[in-house]
C-alpha cells in the first residue's frame, strides 16, 4: 500500500505533586516503521526515562503507537515529541495547561 502519514497527538495528565505525564500518540500511519521519542531542549531523552507502546494495527489497515514520559510541571516548553516516518519528520510541543489535546496531521 501507499504511505499514509501519522496523525500526532500530544496530551498531558497529572502524575504526582509537581509532575505531569506527557503522552505522544501517533496513529493512522502506514507502513508500520516509525520513530517516536521525547526530546528535552532538542536532545533525545534516555531510553529508560520513556515508556513506549507497541506498534499495533488499528483495524483500518494502518498502525498506531505512543511514547510517554514524566516531566516537571512548568518545564513543558522544553519538551517536544519527535516523529519520523517514511523519510519525513516533525516535532510536536506539549500543550499548555489549559488545552489538553493537540492534533497535527503530518504531511
Amino acid at each position: 500500500g501507499s504511505t499514509v502519514p501519522p496523525m500526532v497527538n500530544v496530551t498531558r495528565s497529572e502524575a504526582s505533586e509537581g509532575n505531569i505525564t506527557v503522552t505522544c500518540r501517533a496513529s493512522g500511519f502506514y507502513p508500520w516503521n516509525i520513530t517516536l521519542s521525547w526530546r528535552q531542549d532538542g536532545v533525545s531523552l534516555s531510553h529508560d526515562t520513556q515508556q513506549w507502546g507497541d506498534v499495533l494495527p488499528d483495524g483500518n489497515g494502518t498502525y498506531q503507537t505512543w511514547v510517554a514520559t514524566r516531566i516537571c510541571q512548568g518545564e513543558e516548553q522544553r519538551f517536544t515529541c519527535y516523529m519520523e516516518h517514511s523519510g519525513n519528520h516533525s516535532t510536536h510541543p506539549v500543550p499548555s495547561g489549559n488545552s489538553h489535546h493537540h492534533h497535527h496531521h503530518h504531511h
Epitope: W32, G53, G59, N60
Partner: antibody, heavy 122, light 112 residues
C-alpha cells in the same frame, strides 16, 4: 482495572441471530482493544475478533467473518457482537476481554467479562 | 493458522511441588513489531480465564512471583515454583502475534 459486564444467557433457535453486549466502566473505553472469544464446555478457547474502540477498526478470525459482527457504542462504553445464522455448533460461552493500549500491560486479554452462555436449540 | 500444542494434557501435583508446563507453537511467533505475544492464562471451573504472564515472561499485576514464564522461538514454558491449592485449574497458552490468534488445548493441573 474497571468492570466488564456481559449480557445474560440466551436461548435461541437455529437460524436466528443474537446480539451480545459487554458494558464497561471504570476505564477509558476508547483506549481499548475489545476482543470476543468462544469456549465450548470442556474445551479450549477460540479468538473470534477484536475491535479497537478508539476508531471502530476490526480484525477477525477468518473462521468467523461470516458469522460475527463487532461494533461499539462509545456513548455508553459498550461493545457488541452480533452472531448470525446460528447452529448448534455455536452453543458456547462467549467472553469479552480487553487490552488497555495505553496501560502498562502488553497483554491482549488483561481483563475479562464474566461470559454469556448461548444455547442454540430447536 | 499457528497451532499451539500444550503438554502434558494433565499434570498431577502435590501441594508445594514445582510444576512445569510446556507450550510449543507450529511456527515462530514474533510479531512484525518485534514483540512475542505469548501469554499464559489460568481458568478455574465456572470462572473466566485470568491472565498470568504476557510477552513470554512478564508477570501481570497481582500475579505471585512463584509463576514464571520463559522461552523463545517456538518453545515456551510456564513454571510454578511451589504449587498452592489456588493454582489448580486449566492453564492455556496463547499466541497473539499472528492472526488468527490461537490458544493451546490446555494443561489441567490437579492434585495427585
Amino acid at each position: 482495572q474497571g468492570q466488564m459486564q456481559q449480557s445474560g444467557a440466551e436461548l435461541v433457535k437455529p437460524g436466528a441471530s443474537v446480539k451480545l453486549s459487554c458494558k464497561t466502566s471504570g476505564f477509558t473505553f476508547s483506549d481499548n482493544y475489545i476482543s470476543w472469544l468462544k469456549q465450548k464446555p470442556g474445551q479450549s478457547l477460540e479468538w473470534i475478533a477484536w475491535i479497537y474502540a478508539g476508531t471502530g477498526g476490526t480484525s477477525y478470525n477468518q473462521k468467523f467473518t461470516a458469522k460475527a459482527q463487532l461494533t461499539v457504542d462509545t456513548s455508553s462504553s459498550t461493545a457488541y457482537m452480533q452472531f448470525s445464522s446460528l447452529t448448534t455448533e455455536d452453543s458456547a460461552i462467549y467472553y469479552c476481554a480487553r487490552h488497555d493500549y495505553y496501560g502498562t500491560s502488553g497483554a491482549w486479554f488483561a481483563y475479562w467479562g464474566q461470559g454469556t452462555l448461548v444455547t442454540v436449540s430447536a | 493458522d499457528v497451532l499451539m500444542t500444550q503438554t502434558p494434557l494433565s499434570l498431577p501435583v502435590s501441594l508445594g511441588d514445582q510444576a512445569s508446563l510446556s507450550c510449543r507453537s507450529s511456527q515462530n511467533i514474533v510479531h512484525i513489531n518485534g514483540n512475542t505475544y505469548l501469554e499464559w492464562y489460568l481458568q478455574k471451573p465456572g470462572q473466566s480465564p485470568k491472565l498470568l504472564i504476557y510477552k513470554v515472561s512478564n508477570r501481570f499485576s497481582g500475579v505471585p512471583d512463584r509463576f514464571s514464564g520463559s522461552g523463545s522461538g517456538t518453545d515456551f514454558t510456564l513454571k510454578i515454583s511451589r504449587v498452592e491449592a489456588e493454582d489448580l485449574g486449566v492453564y492455556y497458552c496463547f499466541q497473539g502475534s499472528h492472526v488468527p490468534w490461537t490458544f493451546g488445548g490446555g494443561t489441567k493441573v490437579e492434585i495427585k
